[in-house]
């Protein structure tokens, strides 16, 4: 019996067709991507195969402004267009409260959500009863296939759940619930959901009984053959994990963004084993055209953005400086109202020992793209931040060795007075630098806040203890020279859309006056 | 879709003037710094200068510095060439181009400016 | 300034060849370097930066190395359309070009 699996994972908003790095699209006949081109690929697959499921691994929402103006409701209406068989719950998913998921997702959603490793705890436990579940058994033509979801056990530092949401670790709970459908004689099981790929692996290694592992959380891209386009494969599509009783499962992601649709097919005997697997993303490119009537239905609800996007978020009785004489060459205002909105976008009172998980923040001031003069009767919208935060960036967080983070303040003013990018605006850390001494030893001050302490307040960077940095994903990439990072960090989850994170900090401070205030110091 | 027309080339005498100009579409030009870049006939290319998304900083090559003026205006998605006393080696096709060697690079198709007598 | 040296400044070769096409700079520059292919009467096109990124839409047989002082650009199976000039460029200080390498058919 043969099964076709299509997936996505980690489309974070991209309803609408993207450039092929997954920004706005700019030149539409070389774009990628978006719901109508997928809806076109699946129905094609549909119409040609007998047995197919349509998965999505999470981290639907977070990441354009669709999701900052329709808070999930899109992601529920265009998956339903698109009939998808399964979603796992991301870590996104709760980036607006557990309400902001019930309400315009679990309810609105006709396709089961799932997740093993999240339960519901005191008034929340009967309230989202029912609404997402560990498993699913789902009728595929004259079969039947289970389908278990999981998510990220760290979503408590990536997001918001809540304090009445406990995450399990996942392998531990999975095993049961496999073990049930088990019991239930349903023999060809597929592990859903979004840990990120070595997670994924680890499940396809230790709990028994999973047949296939479809992840997220980690962008990975997997390929057999010559990629399509720019992205890197991490492996072989599919990944095969030789699990601890000696089967061979399958692991498969579909990288992110909806550039790819992953395509797998499975043949099992009449036991329930996979006697083969092969497939490969399908790259959505232009080639495919895009469904005219989901597209005209994505035209419909664009109307409502181009309103937002010229309404007023907040106010600032100060001159926003965002410009390059500053924000390259020394503290600007601008760099220190971001880098503040991102520390606050990451408030998780998660330990008493700690005030937050993480209190720092760096940021490359060629990022800083516009001023906003507060002239203008101090109106901030999200055009004029659209202009300050240009590139369609994510704010993420990553874990650094103090070492690494001393390398990057050596690299941010290495080649100092032209102008160039490197330069880092910065919270909760103070940096002092001395120009007169050679590149790479100009760093003679470094002090960071504390994290656990209940004062916060400013100690020497240790160079062995490992910190958690909130930073633009194009610095955790290594963009602007910063290769120290991307080469020596620890740990990296990716966070939510630059432009929302600063909308929703001055929104919610309503009036803003950062100031210059000694953060970066010249010796 | 991303656009950069060159205008304002043509023939000067050696020690004339002449004005280039750059007019962008399809992209929020006041988000980018700009650049000039040039190539003689038959030659490499050769950087000219280079402006910032808000025009607070400019920096030229050391061939051009003194004589020629990179300027913009944002409001009107443009960017410009002053280049007084032209000698014949600034004899090329000028191009304009978005943030070279990033991300964000784009080109113009050229305009050639000859200087002679 | 910093000064870029290409080599060989011309090269003959064939489809399906695999190409290497080498800049060197005077001094070192980290990894701002960049590599671009122009067509004659066209503008150039960017195909590599930060030495290694390949830009949107550049296939995946153009590849870049290198940090430092010493860069490559490599093309894995030479396409028809790949014949061209190709220039490699720093931007540590204020940007400079190497003098070009002309790539033709054999």
């Known amino acids: 019996w043969e099964l076709t699996i299509l997936h996505t994972n980690d489309v974070h908003s991209r309803l609408e067709q993207t450039s092929e790095d997954s920004s706005k699209c700019v030149n539409a006949s070389r774009c990628m991507g978006g719901v109508a081109r997928l809806f076109t690929k699946v129905q094609q697959i549909r119409r040609a195969e007998p047995n197919v499921l349509l998965l999505d691994a999470g981290d639907q929402y977070q990441g354009t402004i669709w999701f900052t103006v329709y808070k999930g409701a899109e992601v529920a209406h265009f998956m339903n267009a698109l009939r998808y068989d399964a979603m796992a719950l991301g870590n996104h998913e709760f980036d607006n409260g557990v309400e902001g998921l019930i309400e315009p997702l679990l309810k609105e959603a006709k396709f089961p959500i799932l997740s093993a490793n999240i339960k519901a705890k005191g008034p929340l436990a009967s309230q989202i009863s029912g609404l997402y579940l560990p498993y699913k058994v789902l009728p595929v033509g004259d079969e039947v296939v289970g389908i278990v979801g999981y998510t990220s056990k760290e979503t408590p530092f990536l997001s918001n759940p809540g304090t009445n949401l406990v995450f399990e670790d996942e392998i531990t709970a999975l095993q049961p619930e496999v073990d049930k459908l088990k019991t239930l004689n349903v023999n060809k099981i597929i592990a859903l959901g979004h840990s990120g790929f070595e997670m994924d692996k680890l499940i396809a290694q230790k709990v028994r009984g999973v047949d296939v592992v479809v992840g997220g959380h980690s962008n990975t891209f997997l390929y057999t053959g010559n990629p399509p386009s720019k992205e890197v494969p991490a492996g072989k599509y599919p990944f095969i994990v030789t699990s601890d009783d000696g089967r061979k499962v399958p692991v498969v992601q579909a990288y992110a963004f909806g550039k790819y649709l992953g395509y797998l097919k499975i043949e099992f005997d009449e036991r329930g084993n996979v006697i083969s697997s092969h497939g490969n993303p399908i790259l959505l490119n232009s080639s495919i055209p895009e469904d005219p009537s989901i597209k005209a239905d994505i035209n419909k609800w664009r109307i409502k953005l181009d309103n937002y996007s010229t309404q007023e978020l907040g106010k600032t009785i100060v001159y926003l400086d965002g410009s390059s004489q500053s924000c390259r060459f020394r503290e600007c205002n601008m760099g220190n109202l971001i880098c503040d909105a991102m520390i606050n976008n990451n408030l998780r009172h998660t330990d008493e020992m700690f005030w937050n998980h993480v209190s720092m923040c760096i940021l490359n001031g060629g990022g800083i793209r516009s001023p906003i003069d507060e002239r203008n009767n101090g109106t901030i919208t999200w055009e004029n931040l659209a202009a300050v935060l240009p590139f369609g960036g994510t704010f993420d967080l990553v874990q650094l060795k103090g070492s690494t983070l001393k390398k990057a303040f050596e690299h941010s003013v290495h080649r100092y007075g032209q102008s160039t990018g490197e330069f880092l605006q910065v919270g909760g850390i103070h940096v002092v630098y001395d120009l007169s001494r050679k590149p790479g030893d100009r760093v003679v001050k470094l002090d960071v806040l504390c994290t656990k302490c209940r004062v916060p307040s400013y100690d020497p960077l240790k160079m062995d203890e490992v910190y958690k940095v909130i930073l633009p994903n194009f610095l955790a990439n290594g963009g602007d020279g910063f290769q120290m990072i991307k080469d020596e960090l620890l740990r990296h989850d990716s966070g939510d859309q630059d432009i929302n994170v600063v909308s929703t900090y001055i929104s919610k401070m309503k009036v803003i006056y950062p100031a210059v205030e000694g953060r970066i110091k010249f010796s | 879709e991303v656009q950069l027309v060159e205008s304002g080339g043509g023939l000067v005498q050696p020690g004339g003037s002449l004005r280039l100009s750059c007019a962008a579409s399809g992209f929020t030009f006041s988000s980018y710094d700009m650049h000039w870049v040039r190539q003689a006939p038959g030659k490499g290319l050769e950087w000219v200068a280079v402006m910032s998304y808000d025009g607070s900083n400019k920096y030229y090559a050391d061939s051009v510095k003194g004589r020629f003026t990179i300027s913009r205006d944002n409001s009107k998605n443009a960017l410009y060439l002053q280049m007084n006393s032209l000698r014949a080696e600034d004899t090329a096709v000028y191009y304009c181009?978005?943030?070279?060697?990033?991300?964000?690079?784009?080109w113009g198709q050229g305009t050639l400016v000859t200087v002679s007598s | 300034a910093i000064q870029m040296t290409q080599s060989p400044s011309s090269l003959s070769a064939s489809v399906g060849d695999r190409v290497t096409i080498t800049c060197r700079a005077s001094?070192?520059?980290?990894?701002?370097l960049a590599w671009y292919q122009q067509k004659p009467g066209k503008a150039p096109k960017l195909l590599i930066y930060a030495a290694s990124t390949l830009q949107s839409g550049v296939p995946s047989r153009f590849s870049g190395s290198g940090s430092g002082t010493d860069f490559t650009l490599t093309i894995s199976s030479l396409q028809p359309e790949d014949f061209a000039t190709y220039y490699c460029q720093q931007s540590y200080s204020t940007p400079h070009f190497g003098q070009g390498t002309r790539l033709e058919i054999k």
């Open positions: 181009a978005t943030e070279i060697a990033a991300k964000g690079d784009y």
């Open positions: 001094q070192g520059i980290s990894n701002y």
